[in-house]
């Protein structure tokens, strides 16, 4: 039997303090590097062990980052997004979108643009 995958999308403000080795995560996405079909957003692809993000514990792989220090990440080239993080200063505020799988219903399929695929 096919199961429908439902998601709960939540947003959270995460304040990180840049550590000795930086913020401690990798990103994918951008207008020139679409990670999810029809979505040029910026996604977290890796949380580095013992980095600032890992020690904080709230940012997760697969999260979409909506803004950095209030600056929207929409319609940015990949490298411009990277540069934005690198120049964000010591205290960095991230607005992130978590996407949690919550239920398997009776019918349906996962969409083509699912970032967890």
């Amino acid at each position: 039997m096919n199961g429908r995958v439902d998601y709960l999308v939540t947003e959270e403000e995460i304040n990180l303090t840049r550590g000795p080795s930086g913020l401690g995560f990798n990103i994918v996405g951008g207008t020139d590097q679409q990670y999810v079909s029809n979505d040029s957003g910026i996604y977290v692809s890796r949380i580095k062990e013992n980095g600032a993000a890992a020690l904080d514990g709230r940012l997760q792989e697969g999260d979409k980052i909506l803004s950095v220090n209030g600056q929207d990440l929409k319609n940015l080239l990949h490298q411009d997004a990277v540069d934005l993080f690198r120049n964000a200063g010591y205290a960095v505020s991230l607005r992130v979108q978590h996407r949690l799988q919550v239920q398997n219903g009776p019918i349906g399929h996962r969409g083509e643009g699912d970032p967890s695929g």
Epitope: G22, L23, N26, I27, V28, Q33, V44, R46, Q79, V82
Partner: nanobody, 128 residues
């Protein structure tokens, strides 16, 4: 997970050339940042070269600059290392490595801990 398969190694005389290939699985190859490392018997793993996701940024160890060229073909899910003017000291097992995405911090290209996945390696032997 990402699988990496290297090929192209072999035995070559000093001054000769080889071209190594690294094929990576996964539909998001174009988001990978990638590198080549090598390990000679009894020595630590050593950084050789790095290439960014689009292929526009490359970095090399001083010992191979001007002789080795790293490149990638995102349509073929493949990274290459063209090795010219080979020397006996280039003899080693060559490994390709992948990091998923770009670090938001200054990238330490030569640090093996920056990479998430590793191939099994291909042997390169350069004879006198």
């Amino acid at each position: 997970d990402v699988q990496l398969v290297e090929s192209g190694g072999g035995l070559v005389q000093a001054g000769g050339s080889l071209r190594l290939s690294c094929v990576a699985s996964g539909r998001t190859f174009s988001t990978y940042t990638m590198g080549w490392f090598r390990q000679a018997p009894g020595k630590e793993r050593e950084f050789v070269a790095h290439i960014g996701w689009s292929g526009s940024s490359t970095y090399y160890a001083d010992s191979v600059k001007g002789r080795f060229t790293i490149s990638r073909d995102n349509a073929k899910n493949t990274m290459y290392l063209q090795m010219n003017s080979l020397k006996p000291e280039d003899t080693a097992v060559y490994y390709c490595a992948v990091a998923i995405g770009s670090p938001v911090d200054s990238y330490r290209h030569s640090d093996p801990l920056e990479y998430d996945y590793w191939g099994q390696g291909t042997q390169v032997t350069v004879s006198e």
